[in-house]
């Protein structure tokens, strides 16, 4: 009986630790996408609607803030699209890029952790164009560090929650 009690306590401890594991999945806020063809920071994301969720991390001023030191898996998926019903492309040669950036407040610095993308030729003869970028990686993050997303050509972003999103989850503590 004692072993059972110990076992259930162990399960409970494991479960509560898992529940306390920080994670975030943020989806693009389509009502507030900036314009521009150069690199711009995407600051408007949902954290609590549809597929978007956050726990033991903070979303503030367009940045995902780490609350616990640890090793995290970071990911981002960015979709670009253009349909002729919205007009024509002002240029057919495009650089479609995403940059995942870490900013440290304690020692003011900024680093690109991941980037992805391609140069594309989107011919005006086609009715529809689509391109998707997915990046992911494993990083040591400290409490207070901030993760942000920058993209090129934000006016071409696909605004659906299953298309443009980013997130993080803690995998293990720092020894």
């Amino acid at each position: 009986e004692k072993a059972m009690v110990d076992g259930s306590w162990l399960d409970l401890a494991k479960r509560s630790k898992l529940e306390a594991q920080p994670f975030a999945h943020l989806t693009i806020n389509a009502t507030d996408i900036p314009s521009g063809s150069h690199k711009v920071s995407l600051s408007s994301w949902y954290h609590d609607r549809g597929w978007a969720k956050i726990s033991n991390m903070t979303f503030s001023n367009g940045k995902l803030i780490v609350n616990q030191d640890g090793f995290y898996y970071l990911y981002a998926n960015i979709c670009f699209r253009h349909h002729e019903t919205s007009g024509d492309l002002a240029t057919e040669y495009l650089q479609l890029m995403v940059y995942v950036t870490k900013t440290s407040i304690k020692i003011p610095s900024s680093h690109t952790l991941m980037k992805g993308g391609s140069t594309k030729y989107w011919s005006g003869n086609s009715e529809f164009h689509f391109y998707s970028i997915n990046v992911g990686g494993f990083f040591k993050l400290r409490s207070g560090e901030e993760i942000s997303i920058e993209v090129s050509n934000p006016s071409l972003l696909d605004p659906d929650q299953d298309a443009t999103y980013f997130g993080a989850f803690k995998v293990r503590d720092i020894d």
Partner: antibody
Amino acid sequence: QVQLVQSGAEVRKPGASVKVSCKASGYDFSNYAIHWVRQAPGQRLEWMGWINAGNGNTKFSQKFQGRITVTRDTAASTAYMELRSLRSEDTAVYYCARDSSNAVRGIIIAYYFDYWGQGTLVTVSS
Amino acid sequence: EIVMTQSPSSLSASVGDRVTITCRASQSISRYLNWYQLKPGKAPRLLIYGASSLQSGVPSRFSGSGSGAEFTLTISSLQPEDIATYYCQHTRAFGQGTKVEIK
């Protein structure tokens, strides 16, 4: 304030060419596209083509492909539309119009024509 | 190629009347629909863009609605200066126009 001022009326014989100018003022010419639209007597408005004043890219209606040339002089903030091999059915009022979307910031030519020239009457008659 | 069809082709109404013009697209165009006013000898004027957004400087008696393939332009209280031909437009395609006259 934003203004588009077009050149004066023209009369041409069939087979000739005509070049209409459109001088822009009151905004950064290079940041926007200029469209050309015409209206023949008793007909609907008809889109002809656009030029991105920043990079010179152009797009034309299939109907005019091969007969139309659109150019721009950024120093003079002026766009030009030349139509060749004129026929009587090209008799129309020709308008230039600014695309409302800043093509540098937004990358899209949106086809919202927020400012128009006063129109240039081109008469093709033998 | 998308075709825009307006109705009616002309209408006559009294000052103060509510006037409605309809525009249909041959396929769905979301909300990418604009309305213009054209008076003889004058430059066309953008009234409504994106189906329902009022262009700056346009009187609030003009309004637009609709999405997909069916759209309307409404003049809530017709004024003498509203005598003109009205065109709907989606990218490269214009409707055939609706001529509005005063009774």
